[in-house]
């Protein structure tokens, strides 16, 4: 009985989110394998949240726009081991927007879930930012590692998505 | 006072090449970004070129890619637009334009008189 | 690439009166409550001169006269009152996005 009300309440979830996802990939974890955790297909996961990949050209006010679209934001980096993850997913030659910016060119980072920037936690490449115009963050390879780099917000790049894990 | 003063213009050939100048004076050339905007006769305004400040980025339209280069020497303070294989429909007054950065984007703030190029044979 | 639309392409305004330009982009050139459209007066035989930026802000040695308003993809600028050395084409231009583009132009006369 237990287990068919909560089979009952999965499968209501699961139509709510149809709606925005229509394909949701799930995993089961927790201390008794109870819970589901999914990500829209087909975005890739890692710890408490869902990744995708955007290979459009767009500006970062426009990738912003079209990750909220999706229940998302730009991607937020906390940690090396997260961005050590994203980047096994990423083309060396290709730049991806992040979602940090700095729009009054103060040198005021701020990333668009309102995270504090914090400095000891980022992940600049050497010499970098550079410049009060370039107002928005990608991240790139360059000199042999992943690191972020400060550009245009105008110019088209590709970029990164991020959003909270569903719970079912 | 910025001053921005464009020289080069001409009448040349279809297919033929030109060279224009802009000469800047009254603020710190290296720190904007600059671009070249033309306009045709009796037509409105057309984005050509833009080159960053530290000379990293540029970008054209297609109408003009692989025809046209823009660069900078900011020694000289001095921006160029190099125009090979130059069309009929390239004719126009080309501005050189200061760009100023705001939030996510920019707006030119300050124009050259322009100088004129004719294409035609 | 982002079309900017302007209407009217002319219109007469006798001195004193208001003229109202409209500029429409095919998509929204706002972000978080910054507007980027900006206006530019061009006189005949005259390179462009920045009226007003981010939609709203006057550009510094602008008279009063000139305001301009809108967001999202549907901007404004008016000339209230307007003065006889007001005739000239006037430009709306986008920069969320490269490429930067420019309307149509308006061209306003004065009666």
């Known amino acids: 009985n237990f287990m068919y009300s909560k089979t009952v309440k999965r499968l209501s979830k699961l139509q709510e989110y149809q709606q925005y996802y229509p394909s949701l990939t799930c995993v089961m974890e927790g201390k008794d394998m109870e819970d589901w955790s999914c990500c829209p297909t087909p975005w890739t996961s890692f710890q408490s949240s869902c990744y995708f990949i955007s290979t459009v050209m767009q500006s970062w006010t426009k990738s912003q726009n079209n990750c909220s679209v999706m229940g998302a934001d730009l991607v937020v980096i906390n940690t090396k081991e997260e961005q050590d993850f994203i980047t096994q997913n990423l083309k060396i030659n290709s730049a991806y927007f992040l979602g940090l910016s700095d729009p009054k060119g103060w040198r005021h980072w701020q990333w668009v879930d309102q995270t504090p920037y914090n400095k000891n936690v980022t992940f600049w490449h050497s010499g970098e930012p550079n410049s009060p115009d370039e107002r928005c963050a990608i991240i790139n390879f360059r000199s042999e590692e992943w690191g972020w780099n400060d550009v245009h917000c105008h110019v088209p790049q590709k970029s990164i998505c991020k959003m909270k894990k569903i719970y079912i | 006072e910025v001053q921005l003063v464009e020289s080069g213009g001409g009448l040349v050939k279809p297919g033929g090449s030109l060279r224009l100048s802009c000469a800047a004076s009254?603020?710190?050339?290296?720190?904007?970004?600059m671009s070249w905007v033309r306009q045709a006769p009796g037509k409105g305004l057309e984005w050509v070129s833009t080159?960053?400040?530290?000379?990293?980025?540029?970008y054209y339209p297609d109408s003009v890619k692989g025809r046209f280069t823009i660069s900078r020497d900011n020694a000289k303070n001095s921006l160029y637009l190099q125009m090979n294989s130059l069309r009929a429909e390239d004719t126009a007054v080309y501005y050189c334009?200061?760009?100023?950065?705001?939030?996510?984007?920019?707006?030119?703030?300050?124009w050259g008189q322009g100088t004129t190029v004719t294409v035609s044979s | 690439d982002i079309v900017l639309t302007q209407s009217p392409a002319s219109l007469a305004v006798s001195p004193g009166q208001r003229a109202t330009i409209t500029c429409r982009a095919s998509?929204?050139?706002?972000?978080?409550?910054?507007?980027?459209m900006h206006w530019y007066q061009q006189k005949p035989g005259q390179p462009p001169k920045l009226l007003i930026y981010a939609a709203s802000n006057l550009e510094s040695g602008v008279p009063a006269r000139f305001s301009g308003s809108g967001s999202g993809t549907d901007f404004t600028l008016t000339i209230n009152p307007v003065e006889a050395n007001d005739a000239a084409n006037y430009y709306c231009?986008?920069?969320?996005?490269?490429?930067?583009?420019f309307g149509g132009g308006t061209k306003v006369e004065i009666k």
């Open positions: 998509e929204s050139v706002s972000f978080h409550g910054t507007h980027l």
């Open positions: 080159i960053s400040s530290g000379d990293s980025y540029t």
């Open positions: 231009q986008q920069s969320i996005e490269d490429p930067p583009t």
């Open positions: 009254g603020f710190t050339f290296s720190s904007y970004g």
């Open positions: 334009a200061r760009q100023l950065y705001y939030s996510y984007g920019y707006y030119f703030d300050y």
